[in-house]
Interface confidence: medium
C-alpha cells in the first residue's frame, strides 16, 4: 500500500517536519491517490490487454466519467477559482460510485483499491473546507448511483475489465488536471 500523506514514500530523511498547510495536504493527498491508481493500473494491465485495446469506445458508452473541459475554469486559459473548485468537488463526488465498483475488481491489490476509495473521501472533505460556495455543489443521487452500480456489475467479463481500465485512466486524468488547477489557487 502507498505511504500515507505526510510521510515520504521513498527513503528520504525528513526530521522536524512542519505541520502541513491546507494546500500542501491537498497536494499530498492527490499525489497519494495517484500513486495508488498507478499500482491498480499495473495489476489491470498485467492481467489483461485492456491498456492497449482500441475498443475503448464500446465500453465508454456505458460510462459517464467526469472530465475536465475548458468551460470548467480549471485550465490556465479562462481560469476561475470558484468554478473550478466546484467542478473538482462535483467530479470527485461523481467518481465515488465508480470507485465503489472497483472494490471487488482486484485480487492482489484489494487493499490498494480500498485506500484509493478512502483517500478520495478524505480529499473531498479537505476540498469542501476550502470551498466558499458549497451550495453550487450537486451531490449525485444515491438511487441513480445504486442502479448504475448494478448495471456495471451485470456486464460481461470483457466489459468489466474494460470498465475498470477506463475508470482508472479517467480518474488519473481528472486528478492530474485538478492537481495543476489547485496549484493556481
Amino acid at each position: 500500500a502507498p505511504v500515507p500523506p505526510g510521510e515520504d514514500s521513498k527513503d528520504v530523511a525528513a526530521p522536524h517536519r512542519q505541520p502541513l498547510t491546507s494546500s500542501e495536504r491537498i497536494d499530498k493527498q492527490i499525489r497519494y491517490i495517484l500513486d495508488g491508481i498507478s499500482a491498480l493500473r499495473k495489476e489491470t494491465c498485467n492481467k489483461s490487454n485492456m491498456c492497449e485495446s482500441s475498443k475503448e469506445a464500446l465500453a465508454e458508452n456505458n460510462l459517464n466519467l467526469p472530465k475536465m473541459a475548458e468551460k470548467d475554469g480549471c485550465f490556465q486559459s479562462g481560469f476561475n477559482e470558484e468554478t473550478c473548485l466546484v467542478k473538482i468537488i462535483t467530479g470527485l463526488l461523481e467518481f465515488e460510485v465508480y470507485l465503489e465498483y472497483l472494490q471487488n475488481r482486484f485480487e492482489s491489490s484489494e487493499e490498494q483499491a480500498r485506500a484509493v476509495q478512502m483517500s478520495t473521501k478524505v480529499l473531498i472533505q479537505f476540498l469542501q473546507k476550502k470551498a466558499k460556495n458549497l451550495d453550487a455543489i450537486t451531490t449525485p443521487d444515491p438511487t441513480t448511483n445504486a442502479s448504475l452500480l448494478t448495471k456495471l456489475q451485470a456486464q460481461n467479463q470483457w466489459l468489466q475489465d474494460m470498465t475498470t481500465h477506463l475508470i482508472l485512466r479517467s480518474f488519473k486524468e481528472f486528478l492530474q488536471s485538478s492537481l495543476r488547477a489547485l496549484r493556481q489557487m
Epitope: 528520504v12 497536494d27 475536465m68 488519473k172 492530474q176 488536471s177
Partner: antibody, heavy 120, light 106 residues
C-alpha cells in the same frame, strides 16, 4: 527510447514570427499526464521557461511573454509547435523542447536545442 | 508570480569537496522543485525531482533537501565531471528557473 528534436529557422528577421517544431518519439502526447514544454537560453545566460502543453490541451505560458506565445500539438505526428510573434534581438537564444511526465513535473528528457538568431 | 533566487552565482571548489547550492522561492512551493545540470554546449539534464528524489542513473553523490521556500542541492564529493552550471526550477503554477550556479574546479 525517448528522443526530442527541435527544428526551425536559424535566422529570423526582427518583427517576424518565429515558429519552432519539436518532433518526439518514445512517448505519446495522448497519454494522460504527458507534457511537452519549451525553454530558451540566450547566449551566456540562464534558462528561461516559455510554455508547455499537456495531453488534454491545457496550455501554460510564461506570464512575461504570454501575449507573444502560442503552443499547439499534433498528436498524430508526435509534434509540438511553438510560435513567437514580433521577435527582437533579445529573442536570440538556443531553444529547447523537453518532456514532463506525470505529476512529479520535472523535465526528464530534453532535445539538443536549436540556436535561433534574430537579426536584420 | 513566484520568483526563484539561487545562490551563489558561481563557486570554485577542489575535487573531493562538498558543494552546496541553495534555492529560495518567494512563496511556499512545498516539495515541487527540480535540479538540473547543464554542461557547456549541451542540453540540461535532470538530477533531482520533487526536491529530494534522485532521477534515474544519477550518481548518489548528488542530493537535494528542503521544502516550502528553502531548498539545498549538494554534491557530497566534487568530481572533475561535475563541472557545469546547476539550475533549480519550481513546478507550482508557471515554472521559472533559478539564475544558475556555475561550479568550477580550483
Amino acid at each position: 527510447q525517448v528522443t526530442l528534436r527541435e527544428s526551425g529557422p536559424a535566422l529570423v528577421r526582427p518583427t517576424q514570427t518565429l515558429t519552432l517544431t519539436c518532433t518526439f518519439s518514445g512517448f505519446s502526447l495522448s497519454t494522460s499526464g504527458m507534457t511537452v514544454g519549451w525553454i530558451r537560453q540566450p547566449p551566456g545566460e540562464a534558462l528561461e521557461w516559455l510554455a508547455h502543453i499537456w495531453w488534454n490541451d491545457d496550455k501554460y505560458y510564461n506570464p512575461a511573454l504570454k501575449g507573444r506565445l502560442a503552443v499547439s500539438k499534433d498528436t498524430s505526428k508526435n509534434q509540438v509547435v511553438l510560435s513567437m510573434n514580433t521577435v527582437g534581438p533579445g529573442d536570440t537564444a538556443t531553444y529547447y523542447c523537453a518532456r514532463m511526465e506525470d505529476y512529479d513535473e520535472a523535465m526528464d528528457y530534453w532535445g539538443q536545442g536549436i540556436l535561433v538568431t534574430v537579426s536584420s | 508570480d513566484i520568483q526563484m533566487t539561487q545562490s551563489p552565482s558561481s563557486l570554485s571548489a577542489s575535487v573531493g569537496d562538498r558543494v552546496t547550492i541553495t534555492c529560495r522561492a518567494s512563496e511556499n512551493i512545498y516539495s515541487n522543485l527540480a535540479w538540473y545540470q547543464q554542461k557547456p554546449g549541451k542540453a540540461p539534464k535532470l538530477l533531482i525531482y520533487a526536491a529530494t528524489y534522485l532521477a534515474d542513473g544519477v550518481p548518489s553523490r548528488f542530493s537535494g533537501s528542503g521544502s516550502g521556500t528553502d531548498f539545498t542541492f549538494t554534491i557530497s564529493s566534487l568530481q572533475p565531471e561535475d563541472i557545469a552550471t546547476y539550475y533549480c526550477q519550481h513546478f507550482w503554477g508557471t515554472p521559472p528557473f533559478g539564475q544558475g550556479t556555475k561550479v568550477e574546479i580550483k
